[in-house]
Interface confidence: medium
Amino acid sequence: FERTRSLQDPCSNCPAGTFCDNNRNQICSPCPPNSFSSAGGQRTCDICRQCKGVFRTRKECSSTSNAECDCTPGFHCLGAGCSMCEQDCKQGQELTKKGCKDCCFGTFNDQKRGICRPWTNCSLDGKSVLVNGTKERDVVCGPSPADLSPGASSVTPPAPAREPGHSPQ
């Protein structure tokens, strides 16, 4: 396994894709299949990642680099290096422990992943609702009522909403 390194360490000559074979007087042996060494001077090759099940192979393992996975259709990557695959939902939904659920009234999700987020509250910026929100889309805020004096804008003011940022689904 490990021997004291010297200035003439024979293992330092073993390139990536090989390992320093202690069983064979420290000659450089090629990495076995399904394994790799990404740096020189290694005393073993590491096990390649296997893209199985919901994972699919984006890049095959080579003797010098690990495999890279992504997710099968209907799933998306999570975590560093796509360590997990999470189920896609439709726009207007979020993934819960019980599966995909529609966004609650007053929230939206315009992607196939992630959580439902609250509609923008236009009144906090002194603006009014120009386009009502839906499960899939945020509200669109328009100019404040004061900006809509005659001649100030050609935009037709929207019908006043009962509560800024809310609309019937």
Epitope: R43, T44, D46, I47
Partner: antibody, heavy 115, light 113 residues
Framework: EVQLVESGGGLVKPGESLRLSCAAS????????MAWVRQAPGKGLEWVSS????????YYADSVKGRFTISRDNARNSLSLQMNNLRAEDTAVYYC????????WGRGTLVTVSS | DIVMTQTPLSLPVTPGEPASISCRSS???????????LDWYLQKPGQSPQLLIY???NRASGVPDRFSGSGSGTDFTLKISRVEAEDVGIYYC??????????FGQGTKVEIK
Amino acid sequence: EVQLVESGGGLVKPGESLRLSCAASGFTFKSYPMAWVRQAPGKGLEWVSSISSSGDHRYYADSVKGRFTISRDNARNSLSLQMNNLRAEDTAVYYCPAGRDFDHWGRGTLVTVSS
Amino acid sequence: DIVMTQTPLSLPVTPGEPASISCRSSQSLLYSNGYNYLDWYLQKPGQSPQLLIYWGSNRASGVPDRFSGSGSGTDFTLKISRVEAEDVGIYYCMQALHVPPYTFGQGTKVEIK
């Protein structure tokens, strides 16, 4: 000198849990993939689980998938096997061989699952 | 998964005589780089397994030269040129190509007649 010392075995009832440990020394642990291999009394060798050097990638035999979890702590040169929902057929000596081709083996630790 | 089959399962031997164990795999273990990824292990009574031969024919460090491995593809043989008393134990072959999972043969018990 390479040393692998397994511990944590014992007698448990079906459905209970146990955590095995493997203390490694004498080699650069963090560079080596590790594994657990077991041997039921009077039976042959059976691969249980493997883990990559960084701990990012873990592999399991179908017989233990969903019940066992392999992990490693490279700072402490240690390997672990968390075994949940143990069954009578998990009774075996558990070894932690080092390297892709199981170059070195420890003495093993006995796990007995019996009611 | 690859299935490994060893024969015989029991082998009575005479010290000083040769001995041979066969191992067959359900799929070829010959890789494109020319190596056969088959390993042999010996488990002496009351001890843990030890690597004897790796990649078909390469002796592991410290293994006496009376042990040799041969074969290619799906058929492999472990030979002991002159059996010694300390060679008794159970010999296992293991495929190291399509891993994980690793799969072992059932084992061959070598004992003195």
